[in-house]
């Protein structure tokens, strides 16, 4: 016999990302003896909760909690039994619940209470279900991206930690109901609400962040639909040959379409709406989502929101990735420059329904929404955030880094479990278990 060194014990953490359109569960793991190291926490597994987001259960809160059961049962299998009690479990809800909280705070509270009741039934260390602010969603996404890409600190060959010279990456998240932009900036923000000061591993970071509610992909599509009904009677962003029955109650139930809601409308009425494959009218429709008329600061992105000039490299994830990936992979279109992105959006918007279906087979009706989605992403980046060709060259569209989904969930867990210390790590001897 010979002595065999056992691998280090693993610790686990679970985050339920309760988005506007669906909920995802992420299970993270890390070696127990290296808790303060950077880049050491990784994704162990994930699970997509069937059905809509928890905000869609406003009239049936118990349905929200019931929907989580399948993934929670999977978590019981994925996390070793002896680790259950020590595994923190968090639920964070984002813009879908922020919207519900605006329109129906009682329903929002009921949904959170219902999911809390279910989550406490499991043997994990449940640490709460809450609605994240837009600022938190942006910052935690930024933390996730930079943690995974090891931009905060690294362990060098000489046995000491150092801060990489390459600086941090900006983060852009496009969710279902909101979109966030977050990046490190040198000068103080003119709008204090857009600035966050962070202390990570002994380093100080001044970060600009803003979340635009109602500018997530799904809400943008609803707003464009409302505009199309109002101004055209046809949808310029939908492909010619595609038509569907639109339930007015669905279009106008969101606070995001309140401004376009007619005085008197029958919520149960259905209107037939057809596409016209008109990229120019579609671009005009999308442009209407952004206001550049007034800015109370030295410079703004849109809607009077302060934003310093975009600087450095960025990672764009969630629906940014899915939209650009669709153009690149499914449509076979180049998207390496802003000009190419615009041309790709125009190309998709020119397609008839027959052409689009032939190019991308076996898809549900939301295939018809890729034109609007592409046009919105292109306009948001170029006109909204002010990326020029040079700055756009520094944007990478990514879904995962180091086999871990990029999003706010990991950053949220790292923060709440104190896995990123504020102080610099001291020198410590490492043990190689390979």
């Amino acid at each position: 016999t010979r002595d065999v060194r056992e691998p280090p014990a693993l610790k686990y953490g679970i985050v339920l990302d309760a988005g506007s359109s669906h909920t995802s569960m992420f299970i993270y793991k890390w070696p127990a003896d290296k808790e303060n190291d950077t880049g050491i926490v990784g994704q162990h597994s994930s699970c997509d909760v069937p059905g809509g987001g928890i905000s869609s259960y406003a009239d049936n809160p118990s349905g929200a909690s019931q929907s989580l059961v399948g993934c929670l049962e999977q978590a019981l299998q994925d996390v070793p039994k002896e680790r259950h009690a020590g595994t923190p479990l968090y639920l964070g809800a984002t813009a879908g619940m922020r919207l519900l909280n605006l329109t129906n705070p009682e329903a929002s509270t009921s949904v959170l209470m219902a999911v809390t009741h279910t989550l406490t039934q499991y043997p994990f260390d449940f640490r709460g279900a809450r609605i994240l602010s837009g600022q938190e969603e942006g910052v935690f996404g930024w933390v996730t991206a930079n943690y995974l890409l090891e931009n905060f600190i690294k362990y060098g060959w000489v046995g000491r930690w150092f801060r990489p010279r390459k600086g941090t990456l900006g983060a852009m998240d496009l969710g279902g109901a909101s979109t966030q932009i977050t990046f490190e900036t040198t000068s103080p923000a003119e709008d204090r609400a857009s600035e966050v000061q962070l202390h990570l591993y002994g380093q100080h970071y001044r970060v600009y962040t803003h979340s635009f509610l109602c500018y997530g992909r799904d809400q943008v599509l609803q707003r464009l639909l409302a505009s199309a009904l109002q101004t055209h009677g046809f949808h310029p962003c939908w492909p010619r040959g595609f038509s569907t029955q639109v339930l007015l109650g669905d279009v106008y139930q969101s606070p995001c379409t309140m401004a376009q809601r007619p005085q008197n409308f029958n919520s149960s009425a259905r209107v037939s709406l057809s596409g016209s494959s008109d990229p120019h009218l579609c671009r005009d429709l999308v442009s209407g989502l952004f206001s550049f008329s007034s800015c109370p600061f030295s410079r703004c992105s849109f809607n009077g929101v302060f934003q310093p000039p975009v600087a450095g490299n960025f990672v764009a994830f969630s629906a940014f990735f899915y939209t650009v990936d669709f153009l690149r992979t499914s449509m076979g279109l180049p998207v390496a420059t802003l000009q190419q992105l615009e041309a790709a959006a125009v190309n998709v918007c020119n397609q008839t329904w027959a052409q689009l279906q032939a190019r991308v087979p076996g898809q549900r009706a939301r295939l018809a929404d890729y034109c609007a989605g592409a046009m919105f992403v292109q306009q948001l980046l170029s006109r909204g955030y002010g990326f020029d060709e040079r700055a756009f060259g520094g944007v990478i569209f990514q879904k995962k880094a180091a086999d871990t989904a990029v999003g706010w969930a990991l950053g949220y867990m790292l923060n709440l479990t104190n896995l990123i210390p504020a102080d610099p790590p001291g020198l410590r001897k490492g043990t190689d278990f390979s």
Epitope: D48, P50, D325, F326, T329, S330, G332, A354, Q355, Q357, A358, R359, V360, P361, G362, Q363, R364
Partner: antibody
Framework: QVQLVQSGAEVKKPGSSVKVSCKAS????????VSWVRQAPGQGLEWMGR????????RYAQKFQGRVTITADESTSTAYMELSSLRSEDTAVYYC?????????????WDQGTLVTVSS | SYELTQPLSVSVALGQTARITCSGD??????VYWYQQKPGQAPVLVIY???NRPSGIPERFSGSNSGNTATLTISRAQAGDEADYYC???????????FGGGTKLTVL
């Protein structure tokens, strides 16, 4: 009633190429697409790539990228699949399948397939 | 990359109901197609868009799809239903058709 008719069985040496044809008899490729799917002996179905002749649009499975070329001649309603750098693992029945708009471009008409044997 | 998982084999008594599953991440968000393949023959489309039958396919064949599982149901199974069954779905992320590994249905 559209039928697909493929070329006959082939025996090829490792390292060589094979080109299989698929003709739509009793119809054209207008509004249709053609996929190529292979099946190794005793194995499952494996999608290789597709072409939308009327759009000149092709897509290939990553596994075959750079090794497979799918083309179509609209005038003769014939699709072709060429696979290069053949190895013994490429021994399989190669099917062409029509993708129809009526079925959201899933495979509604298949030919009986072409057996390609790769052997030294 | 996206994968579809099927049981290797399913057995059913003559006249009873057979259920063949096909699982994949959030498969309920995609359309699923089912193909029947008998020995020495080309595959035949039996279900498209989750639950629709092409003309000529008996009503005994039906499909469903939600969450992470799609199911092909064959009621009143007959000896002639013995075959390999494949589910398929289009993977938007890699722009490719994906087939499940196939399920051998045996009618006892």
């Amino acid at each position: 009633q559209v039928q697909l008719v493929q070329s006959g069985a082939e025996v090829k040496k490792p390292g060589s190429s094979v080109k299989v044809s698929c003709k739509a008899s009793g119809g054209t490729f207008d509004s249709y697409a053609v996929s190529w799917v292979r099946q190794a002996p005793g194995q499952g179905l494996e999608w290789m790539g597709r072409i939308v002749p009327w759009l000149g649009f092709t897509r290939y499975a990553q596994k075959f990228q750079g090794r497979v070329t799918i083309t179509a001649d609209e005038s003769t309603s014939t699709a072709y699949m060429e696979l290069s750098s053949l190895r013994s693992e490429d021994t399989a029945v190669y099917y062409c399948a029509r993708e129809s708009p009526g079925y959201r471009y899933s495979f509604d008409v298949w030919d009986q397939g072409t057996l390609v044997t790769v052997s030294s | 990359s996206y994968e579809l998982t099927q049981p290797l084999s399913v057995s059913v008594a003559l006249g009873q109901t057979a259920r063949i599953t096909c699982s994949g991440d959030a498969i309920g968000e995609k359309y699923v197609y089912w193909y029947q393949q008998k020995p020495g023959q080309a595959p035949v489309l039996v279900i498209y868009d989750d639950n629709n039958r092409p003309s000529g396919i008996p009503e005994r064949f039906s499909g469903s799809n939600s969450g992470n599982t799609a199911t092909l149901t064959i009621s009143r199974a007959q000896a002639g239903d013995e075959a390999d069954y494949y589910c398929a779905s289009y993977d938007l992320q890699q722009a490719r058709w994906v087939f499940g590994g196939g399920t051998k249905l045996t009618v006892l």
